[in-house]
Protein backbone atom coordinates (compact mmCIF):
# COMPACT_ATOMS: atom_id res chain seq x y z
CA UNK A 1 0.00 0.00 0.00
CA UNK A 2 1.03 3.55 -0.55
CA UNK A 3 2.38 6.18 1.71
CA UNK A 4 -0.38 8.74 1.56
CA UNK A 5 -3.54 9.92 -0.04
CA UNK A 6 -4.00 12.98 -2.19
CA UNK A 7 -7.00 15.09 -2.84
CA UNK A 8 -7.89 16.87 -6.05
CA UNK A 9 -10.21 19.76 -6.85
CA UNK A 10 -12.44 21.74 -4.53
CA UNK A 11 -12.15 22.05 -0.79
CA UNK A 12 -10.69 25.04 0.89
CA UNK A 13 -9.25 23.64 4.06
CA UNK A 14 -6.74 21.06 5.09
CA UNK A 15 -7.54 17.42 5.59
CA UNK A 16 -6.35 16.62 9.09
CA UNK A 17 -4.89 13.24 9.85
CA UNK A 18 -5.75 11.32 13.00
CA UNK A 19 -3.61 11.44 16.07
CA UNK A 20 -1.38 8.37 16.21
CA UNK A 21 -0.58 6.47 19.34
CA UNK A 22 2.98 7.66 19.10
CA UNK A 23 3.77 11.38 19.19
CA UNK A 24 2.56 13.19 16.10
CA UNK A 25 2.30 16.74 14.81
CA UNK A 26 1.81 18.53 11.51
CA UNK A 27 5.07 19.84 9.99
CA UNK A 28 4.55 23.51 10.82
CA UNK A 29 3.45 22.62 14.31
CA UNK A 30 6.59 20.54 14.81
CA UNK A 31 8.66 23.70 14.51
CA UNK A 32 6.52 25.56 17.02
CA UNK A 33 6.54 22.61 19.36
CA UNK A 34 10.33 22.75 19.43
CA UNK A 35 10.20 26.44 20.23
CA UNK A 36 7.57 25.92 22.88
CA UNK A 37 9.61 23.21 24.56
CA UNK A 38 12.42 25.67 25.01
CA UNK A 39 10.10 28.36 26.42
CA UNK A 40 9.70 29.10 30.12
CA UNK A 41 7.30 27.04 32.21
CA UNK A 42 5.13 30.09 32.73
CA UNK A 43 4.72 30.52 28.99
CA UNK A 44 3.88 26.85 28.68
CA UNK A 45 1.26 27.17 31.38
CA UNK A 46 -0.32 30.07 29.52
CA UNK A 47 -0.27 28.06 26.32
CA UNK A 48 -1.86 25.19 28.19
CA UNK A 49 -4.86 27.19 29.35
CA UNK A 50 -5.32 28.69 25.89
CA UNK A 51 -5.06 25.27 24.32
CA UNK A 52 -7.61 23.78 26.71
CA UNK A 53 -10.01 26.55 25.84
CA UNK A 54 -9.45 25.93 22.14
CA UNK A 55 -9.94 22.19 22.65
CA UNK A 56 -13.24 22.74 24.42
CA UNK A 57 -14.44 24.95 21.58
CA UNK A 58 -13.38 22.37 19.01
CA UNK A 59 -15.09 19.55 20.85
CA UNK A 60 -18.29 21.56 21.05
CA UNK A 61 -18.07 22.09 17.32
CA UNK A 62 -17.42 18.45 16.58
CA UNK A 63 -20.37 16.90 18.38
CA UNK A 64 -21.54 13.81 16.53
CA UNK A 65 -24.53 14.28 14.25
CA UNK A 66 -27.03 11.59 13.41
CA UNK A 67 -28.65 11.79 10.03
CA UNK A 68 -31.81 10.31 8.58
CA UNK A 69 -32.01 8.32 5.41
CA UNK A 70 -32.61 10.42 2.33
CA UNK A 71 -36.07 9.01 1.76
CA UNK A 72 -36.91 8.45 5.39
CA UNK A 73 -36.28 4.74 5.08
CA UNK A 74 -33.26 2.76 6.23
CA UNK A 75 -30.82 2.57 3.36
CA UNK A 76 -29.63 -0.99 3.38
CA UNK A 77 -28.16 -1.60 6.76
CA UNK A 78 -28.24 1.83 8.28
CA UNK A 79 -29.31 5.42 8.03
CA UNK A 80 -26.44 6.52 5.94
CA UNK A 81 -27.75 9.05 3.44
CA UNK A 82 -27.66 12.70 4.36
CA UNK A 83 -30.22 15.26 3.33
CA UNK A 84 -28.56 17.61 0.86
CA UNK A 85 -28.44 20.55 3.21
CA UNK A 86 -26.34 18.80 5.80
CA UNK A 87 -23.82 17.14 3.54
CA UNK A 88 -20.20 18.00 3.89
CA UNK A 89 -17.58 18.35 1.27
CA UNK A 90 -14.25 16.83 1.94
CA UNK A 91 -11.51 19.23 2.65
CA UNK A 92 -8.16 19.43 1.00
CA UNK A 93 -4.73 17.90 0.99
CA UNK A 94 -4.01 15.52 3.86
CA UNK A 95 -0.26 15.58 3.40
CA UNK A 96 -0.23 19.23 4.43
CA UNK A 97 -1.03 18.09 7.95
CA UNK A 98 1.34 15.18 8.19
CA UNK A 99 4.30 15.02 10.53
CA UNK A 100 6.16 12.01 11.80
CA UNK A 101 6.55 12.82 15.45
CA UNK A 102 5.33 14.99 18.24
CA UNK A 103 7.32 16.35 21.13
CA UNK A 104 6.20 15.21 24.53
CA UNK A 105 4.53 18.08 26.38
CA UNK A 106 3.43 15.94 29.30
CA UNK A 107 5.98 17.67 31.48
CA UNK A 108 3.98 20.87 31.11
CA UNK A 109 0.65 19.08 31.48
CA UNK A 110 -0.02 20.08 27.87
CA UNK A 111 -1.78 17.85 25.37
CA UNK A 112 -2.55 18.65 21.77
CA UNK A 113 -6.10 18.20 20.50
CA UNK A 114 -6.74 14.93 18.72
CA UNK A 115 -6.73 15.15 14.96
CA UNK A 116 -10.13 14.89 13.37
CA UNK A 117 -11.34 11.91 11.38
CA UNK A 118 -11.75 12.57 7.66
CA UNK A 119 -15.53 12.72 7.92
CA UNK A 120 -15.54 15.19 10.81
CA UNK A 121 -13.03 17.43 9.09
CA UNK A 122 -15.17 17.42 5.96
CA UNK A 123 -18.29 18.30 7.92
CA UNK A 124 -16.58 21.18 9.66
CA UNK A 125 -15.14 22.44 6.39
CA UNK A 126 -18.59 22.27 4.85
CA UNK A 127 -19.97 24.30 7.75
CA UNK A 128 -17.19 26.88 7.43
CA UNK A 129 -17.99 27.24 3.75
CA UNK A 130 -21.69 27.59 4.53
CA UNK A 131 -21.00 30.33 7.06
CA UNK A 132 -18.81 32.15 4.55
CA UNK A 133 -21.58 32.02 1.96
CA UNK A 134 -24.14 33.31 4.46
CA UNK A 135 -21.86 36.17 5.45
CA UNK A 136 -21.18 36.94 1.80
CA UNK A 137 -24.91 36.99 1.15
CA UNK A 138 -25.46 39.46 3.96
CA UNK A 139 -22.61 41.63 2.73
CA UNK A 140 -24.23 41.72 -0.71
CA UNK A 141 -27.65 42.50 0.75
CA UNK A 142 -26.13 45.22 2.92
CA UNK A 143 -24.86 46.98 -0.18
CA UNK A 144 -28.37 47.18 -1.59
CA UNK A 145 -30.22 48.63 1.38
CA UNK A 146 -30.20 52.32 2.38
CA UNK A 147 -27.14 53.21 4.48
CA UNK A 148 -25.95 49.61 4.21
CA UNK A 149 -23.00 50.23 1.91
CA UNK A 150 -21.78 53.02 4.18
CA UNK A 151 -22.44 51.03 7.33
CA UNK A 152 -20.35 47.86 7.25
CA UNK A 153 -21.12 47.22 10.93
CA UNK A 154 -24.84 46.73 10.36
CA UNK A 155 -25.83 43.41 11.99
CA UNK A 156 -27.52 40.62 10.13
CA UNK A 157 -30.85 41.30 11.82
CA UNK A 158 -30.61 45.00 11.07
CA UNK A 159 -29.72 44.20 7.48
CA UNK A 160 -32.75 41.95 7.13
CA UNK A 161 -35.06 44.43 8.85
CA UNK A 162 -33.74 47.24 6.70
CA UNK A 163 -34.19 45.11 3.58
CA UNK A 164 -37.79 44.26 4.51
CA UNK A 165 -38.62 47.90 5.20
CA UNK A 166 -36.91 48.97 1.99
CA UNK A 167 -38.84 46.39 -0.03
CA UNK A 168 -42.08 47.49 1.60
CA UNK A 169 -41.32 51.12 0.81
CA UNK A 170 -40.52 50.26 -2.80
CA UNK A 171 -43.71 48.24 -3.02
CA UNK A 172 -45.65 51.19 -1.61
CA UNK A 173 -44.08 53.45 -4.21
CA UNK A 174 -45.08 51.03 -6.95
CA UNK A 175 -48.63 50.94 -5.59
CA UNK A 176 -48.74 54.75 -5.45
CA UNK A 177 -47.29 54.95 -8.94
CA UNK A 178 -49.98 52.61 -10.22
CA UNK A 179 -52.67 54.64 -8.48
CA UNK A 180 -51.30 57.91 -9.89
CA UNK A 181 -51.05 56.40 -13.36
CA UNK A 182 -54.61 55.15 -13.19
CA UNK A 183 -55.87 58.51 -11.94
CA UNK A 184 -53.91 60.37 -14.61
CA UNK A 185 -55.31 58.12 -17.34
CA UNK A 186 -58.80 58.80 -15.98
CA UNK A 187 -58.07 62.49 -16.26
CA UNK A 188 -58.46 63.09 -12.53
CA UNK A 189 -54.91 64.36 -11.89
CA UNK A 190 -52.49 66.61 -13.70
CA UNK A 191 -49.11 64.93 -14.49
CA UNK A 192 -47.21 66.03 -11.37
CA UNK A 193 -45.10 63.77 -9.18
CA UNK A 194 -46.46 62.85 -5.78
CA UNK A 195 -44.46 64.58 -3.03
CA UNK A 196 -44.56 61.41 -0.97
CA UNK A 197 -42.17 59.55 -3.30
CA UNK A 198 -38.88 61.02 -2.15
CA UNK A 199 -40.01 61.27 1.47
CA UNK A 200 -40.72 57.56 1.65
CA UNK A 201 -37.28 56.67 0.37
CA UNK A 202 -35.52 59.21 2.55
CA UNK A 203 -37.22 57.87 5.64
CA UNK A 204 -35.58 54.55 4.93
CA UNK A 205 -32.07 55.93 5.34
CA UNK A 206 -31.98 56.01 9.12
CA UNK A 207 -31.50 52.42 10.21
CA UNK A 208 -30.31 51.54 13.71
CA UNK A 209 -26.65 50.59 14.10
CA UNK A 210 -25.03 48.03 16.39
CA UNK A 211 -21.76 46.15 16.51
CA UNK A 212 -21.61 43.27 14.02
CA UNK A 213 -20.94 39.91 15.68
CA UNK A 214 -19.76 37.24 13.27
CA UNK A 215 -21.03 33.70 13.67
CA UNK A 216 -17.99 32.33 11.82
CA UNK A 217 -17.42 28.80 13.00
CA UNK A 218 -20.20 28.97 15.60
CA UNK A 219 -21.93 25.68 16.35
CA UNK A 220 -23.58 26.69 19.62
CA UNK A 221 -27.30 25.94 19.87
CA UNK A 222 -28.26 29.62 19.59
CA UNK A 223 -25.89 32.54 19.50
CA UNK A 224 -27.24 35.97 20.54
CA UNK A 225 -27.41 36.92 16.88
CA UNK A 226 -29.28 33.75 15.98
CA UNK A 227 -31.71 34.47 18.80
CA UNK A 228 -32.11 37.94 17.36
CA UNK A 229 -32.78 36.43 13.95
CA UNK A 230 -35.50 34.29 15.51
CA UNK A 231 -37.00 37.38 17.11
CA UNK A 232 -36.80 39.07 13.73
CA UNK A 233 -38.74 36.30 12.04
CA UNK A 234 -41.44 36.64 14.70
CA UNK A 235 -41.51 40.38 14.11
CA UNK A 236 -41.68 39.84 10.38
Amino acid sequence: MESSAKMESGGAGQQPQPQPQQPFLPPAACFFATAAAAAAAAAAAAAQSAQQQQQQQQQQQQAPQLRPAADGQPSGGGHKSAPKQVKRQRSSSPELMRCKRRLNFSGFGYSLPQQQPAAVARRNERERNRVKLVNLGFATLREHVPNGAANKKMSKVETLRSAVEYIRALQQLLDEHDAVSAAFQAGVLSPTISPNYSNDLNSMAGSPVSSYSSDEGSYDPLSPEEQELLDFTNWF
Partner: antibody, heavy 120, light 113 residues
Protein backbone atom coordinates in the same frame (compact mmCIF):
# COMPACT_ATOMS: atom_id res chain seq x y z
CA UNK B 1 -32.59 -2.96 -4.03
CA UNK B 2 -29.20 -1.27 -4.17
CA UNK B 3 -27.19 -2.41 -7.18
CA UNK B 4 -23.74 -1.46 -8.43
CA UNK B 5 -22.72 -2.92 -11.78
CA UNK B 6 -19.22 -2.41 -13.14
CA UNK B 7 -18.39 -2.41 -16.84
CA UNK B 8 -16.36 -5.19 -18.42
CA UNK B 9 -12.66 -5.15 -17.67
CA UNK B 10 -10.27 -6.94 -19.97
CA UNK B 11 -6.70 -7.37 -21.08
CA UNK B 12 -4.73 -4.23 -21.90
CA UNK B 13 -1.14 -3.44 -22.80
CA UNK B 14 1.19 -1.73 -20.32
CA UNK B 15 1.19 2.01 -20.96
CA UNK B 16 -2.33 2.02 -22.36
CA UNK B 17 -5.50 3.52 -20.90
CA UNK B 18 -8.79 2.12 -19.71
CA UNK B 19 -11.99 3.65 -18.41
CA UNK B 20 -14.10 1.67 -15.98
CA UNK B 21 -17.70 2.58 -15.27
CA UNK B 22 -20.14 1.59 -12.56
CA UNK B 23 -23.88 2.00 -12.99
CA UNK B 24 -25.81 2.52 -9.76
CA UNK B 25 -29.47 1.84 -9.09
CA UNK B 26 -31.83 1.39 -6.15
CA UNK B 27 -30.76 4.52 -4.26
CA UNK B 28 -30.35 8.25 -4.76
CA UNK B 29 -26.91 8.25 -6.35
CA UNK B 30 -26.19 11.93 -5.70
CA UNK B 31 -26.76 11.44 -1.95
CA UNK B 32 -23.64 9.32 -1.56
CA UNK B 33 -19.91 9.50 -1.85
CA UNK B 34 -18.64 6.73 -4.11
CA UNK B 35 -15.34 4.89 -4.21
CA UNK B 36 -13.19 2.45 -6.14
CA UNK B 37 -11.42 -0.34 -4.27
CA UNK B 38 -9.19 -2.88 -5.96
CA UNK B 39 -7.99 -6.34 -5.11
CA UNK B 40 -4.89 -7.91 -6.55
CA UNK B 41 -5.50 -11.65 -7.21
CA UNK B 42 -5.13 -13.68 -4.02
CA UNK B 43 -4.29 -10.51 -2.10
CA UNK B 44 -6.02 -7.98 0.09
CA UNK B 45 -8.15 -4.94 -0.60
CA UNK B 46 -6.68 -1.57 -1.53
CA UNK B 47 -8.63 1.67 -1.53
CA UNK B 48 -8.07 3.53 -4.81
CA UNK B 49 -10.14 6.71 -4.84
CA UNK B 50 -13.24 8.42 -3.46
CA UNK B 51 -15.45 11.14 -4.91
CA UNK B 52 -17.93 13.36 -3.12
CA UNK B 53 -21.60 13.93 -3.93
CA UNK B 54 -21.19 16.19 -6.95
CA UNK B 55 -17.62 15.43 -7.95
CA UNK B 56 -16.19 18.69 -6.60
CA UNK B 57 -13.78 16.82 -4.33
CA UNK B 58 -11.83 13.69 -5.13
CA UNK B 59 -9.37 11.64 -3.08
CA UNK B 60 -6.73 9.25 -4.30
CA UNK B 61 -4.17 6.81 -3.10
CA UNK B 62 -1.01 8.85 -3.44
CA UNK B 63 0.73 6.53 -5.90
CA UNK B 64 -2.26 6.54 -8.26
CA UNK B 65 -3.13 10.22 -8.26
CA UNK B 66 -1.12 11.09 -11.35
CA UNK B 67 -2.59 8.26 -13.45
CA UNK B 68 -6.13 7.67 -12.20
CA UNK B 69 -9.13 10.00 -12.35
CA UNK B 70 -12.38 9.29 -10.54
CA UNK B 71 -15.50 11.08 -11.79
CA UNK B 72 -19.26 10.74 -11.75
CA UNK B 73 -22.33 11.61 -13.78
CA UNK B 74 -25.24 12.09 -11.39
CA UNK B 75 -27.72 12.51 -14.24
CA UNK B 76 -26.89 9.01 -15.46
CA UNK B 77 -26.06 7.45 -12.06
CA UNK B 78 -22.63 6.39 -13.29
CA UNK B 79 -19.27 6.37 -11.53
CA UNK B 80 -16.09 6.32 -13.61
CA UNK B 81 -12.44 5.48 -13.15
CA UNK B 82 -10.15 6.66 -15.93
CA UNK B 83 -6.81 4.88 -15.75
CA UNK B 84 -3.82 5.84 -17.86
CA UNK B 85 -0.20 4.70 -18.22
CA UNK B 86 -1.28 1.33 -16.90
CA UNK B 87 1.32 -0.91 -15.27
CA UNK B 88 1.39 -4.64 -14.62
CA UNK B 89 0.87 -3.91 -10.92
CA UNK B 90 -2.51 -2.37 -11.76
CA UNK B 91 -3.72 -5.85 -12.62
CA UNK B 92 -6.57 -6.40 -10.18
CA UNK B 93 -10.29 -6.80 -9.69
CA UNK B 94 -11.77 -3.30 -9.40
CA UNK B 95 -14.81 -2.83 -7.21
CA UNK B 96 -17.15 0.11 -7.21
CA UNK B 97 -18.42 0.78 -3.67
CA UNK B 98 -20.91 3.07 -2.04
CA UNK B 99 -19.46 5.21 0.73
CA UNK B 100 -21.84 6.32 3.48
CA UNK B 101 -20.38 9.79 2.98
CA UNK B 102 -21.61 11.73 5.98
CA UNK B 103 -19.84 10.57 9.10
CA UNK B 104 -19.67 7.10 7.65
CA UNK B 105 -16.86 6.26 5.27
CA UNK B 106 -17.30 2.51 5.38
CA UNK B 107 -18.48 0.81 2.19
CA UNK B 108 -21.96 -0.58 2.65
CA UNK B 109 -22.55 -1.83 -0.90
CA UNK B 110 -20.09 -3.22 -3.44
CA UNK B 111 -20.33 -4.06 -7.12
CA UNK B 112 -19.52 -7.53 -8.37
CA UNK B 113 -16.09 -6.36 -9.52
CA UNK B 114 -14.43 -6.19 -12.90
CA UNK B 115 -11.08 -7.76 -13.68
CA UNK B 116 -8.39 -5.73 -15.37
CA UNK B 117 -5.28 -7.50 -16.62
CA UNK B 118 -2.32 -5.38 -17.67
CA UNK B 119 0.09 -7.53 -19.64
CA UNK B 120 2.03 -7.55 -22.88
CA UNK C 1 -0.65 5.80 6.75
CA UNK C 2 -2.55 3.77 9.30
CA UNK C 3 -1.40 0.16 9.07
CA UNK C 4 -3.98 -2.51 9.81
CA UNK C 5 -2.64 -5.86 11.03
CA UNK C 6 -4.84 -8.93 11.17
CA UNK C 7 -4.20 -12.24 12.87
CA UNK C 8 -4.20 -15.06 12.32
CA UNK C 9 -3.76 -15.01 8.57
CA UNK C 10 -5.84 -18.19 8.39
CA UNK C 11 -7.50 -20.66 10.66
CA UNK C 12 -9.53 -23.82 10.33
CA UNK C 13 -12.42 -24.46 12.67
CA UNK C 14 -15.24 -26.92 13.05
CA UNK C 15 -18.88 -26.00 12.60
CA UNK C 16 -20.33 -24.76 15.87
CA UNK C 17 -17.03 -23.51 17.25
CA UNK C 18 -16.47 -19.98 18.49
CA UNK C 19 -13.97 -17.95 16.47
CA UNK C 20 -12.12 -14.78 17.36
CA UNK C 21 -10.40 -12.71 14.67
CA UNK C 22 -8.03 -9.94 15.66
CA UNK C 23 -7.28 -6.59 14.02
CA UNK C 24 -4.79 -4.03 15.27
CA UNK C 25 -4.23 -0.51 13.95
CA UNK C 26 -0.98 1.44 14.08
CA UNK C 27 -2.85 4.52 15.34
CA UNK C 28 -5.94 4.96 17.42
CA UNK C 29 -9.22 4.80 15.52
CA UNK C 30 -11.15 6.20 18.48
CA UNK C 31 -12.15 9.82 18.08
CA UNK C 32 -12.52 11.25 21.57
CA UNK C 33 -15.10 13.90 20.68
CA UNK C 34 -17.76 11.42 19.62
CA UNK C 35 -16.36 8.24 21.19
CA UNK C 36 -16.63 6.44 17.86
CA UNK C 37 -14.15 3.92 16.52
CA UNK C 38 -13.75 4.35 12.77
CA UNK C 39 -13.43 0.66 11.98
CA UNK C 40 -15.44 -1.73 9.81
CA UNK C 41 -15.36 -5.46 9.15
CA UNK C 42 -16.11 -7.10 5.80
CA UNK C 43 -16.70 -10.69 4.77
CA UNK C 44 -15.60 -11.88 1.32
CA UNK C 45 -16.78 -15.32 0.29
CA UNK C 46 -14.96 -17.15 -2.53
CA UNK C 47 -15.73 -15.61 -5.92
CA UNK C 48 -17.84 -12.82 -4.40
CA UNK C 49 -17.38 -9.15 -3.60
CA UNK C 50 -16.88 -7.99 0.00
CA UNK C 51 -19.91 -7.54 2.20
CA UNK C 52 -20.18 -5.14 5.14
CA UNK C 53 -20.65 -6.93 8.46
CA UNK C 54 -19.78 -4.40 11.17
CA UNK C 55 -19.20 -0.64 11.27
CA UNK C 56 -18.27 1.74 14.08
CA UNK C 57 -16.33 -1.29 15.40
CA UNK C 58 -19.42 -2.86 16.96
CA UNK C 59 -22.57 -1.92 15.01
CA UNK C 60 -23.93 -4.86 13.06
CA UNK C 61 -25.14 -4.11 9.55
CA UNK C 62 -28.79 -5.01 9.07
CA UNK C 63 -29.31 -8.50 7.78
CA UNK C 64 -26.06 -9.73 9.33
CA UNK C 65 -26.64 -12.72 11.65
CA UNK C 66 -26.22 -11.93 15.33
CA UNK C 67 -23.55 -14.60 15.68
CA UNK C 68 -21.20 -11.93 14.30
CA UNK C 69 -20.06 -9.47 16.95
CA UNK C 70 -17.55 -6.65 16.72
CA UNK C 71 -15.74 -5.30 19.75
CA UNK C 72 -12.67 -3.36 20.80
CA UNK C 73 -11.58 0.24 20.91
CA UNK C 74 -8.60 2.42 20.13
CA UNK C 75 -6.13 0.16 18.37
CA UNK C 76 -7.29 -3.36 19.23
CA UNK C 77 -10.39 -4.83 17.64
CA UNK C 78 -12.03 -8.22 17.49
CA UNK C 79 -14.59 -9.93 15.28
CA UNK C 80 -16.21 -12.84 17.03
CA UNK C 81 -18.31 -15.56 15.38
CA UNK C 82 -20.11 -17.22 18.27
CA UNK C 83 -20.98 -20.45 16.47
CA UNK C 84 -19.43 -20.94 13.05
CA UNK C 85 -21.58 -22.20 10.22
CA UNK C 86 -20.39 -23.74 6.97
CA UNK C 87 -21.49 -20.64 5.05
CA UNK C 88 -19.06 -18.50 7.08
CA UNK C 89 -16.19 -19.83 4.98
CA UNK C 90 -14.65 -16.57 3.79
CA UNK C 91 -11.87 -14.05 4.16
CA UNK C 92 -12.55 -11.37 6.77
CA UNK C 93 -11.07 -7.88 6.42
CA UNK C 94 -10.92 -4.99 8.84
CA UNK C 95 -10.92 -1.45 7.45
CA UNK C 96 -10.09 1.90 9.00
CA UNK C 97 -12.03 4.90 7.73
CA UNK C 98 -10.56 7.33 10.21
CA UNK C 99 -8.38 9.08 7.68
CA UNK C 100 -7.04 9.00 4.15
CA UNK C 101 -5.72 6.86 2.72
CA UNK C 102 -8.34 4.40 3.92
CA UNK C 103 -6.61 1.10 4.60
CA UNK C 104 -7.57 -2.55 5.02
CA UNK C 105 -6.03 -5.39 6.94
CA UNK C 106 -4.51 -8.22 4.92
CA UNK C 107 -7.41 -10.46 5.86
CA UNK C 108 -8.03 -13.62 7.87
CA UNK C 109 -9.05 -16.68 5.91
CA UNK C 110 -11.57 -18.80 7.76
CA UNK C 111 -11.66 -22.43 6.70
CA UNK C 112 -14.06 -25.09 7.85
CA UNK C 113 -12.63 -28.41 9.03
Amino acid sequence: EVKLVESEGGLVQPGSSMKLSCTASGFTFSDYYMAWVRQVPEKGLEWVATIDYDGSNTYYLDSLKSRFIISRDNAKNILYLQMSSLKSEDTATYYCARDGGYDEDYFDYWGQGTTLTVSS
Amino acid sequence: DIVMSQSPSSLAVSVGEKVTLSCKSSQTLLYSSNQQNYLAWYQQKPGQSPKLLIYWASTRESGVPDRFTGSGSGTDFTLTISSVKAEDLAVYYCHQYYTYPFTFGSGTKLEIK
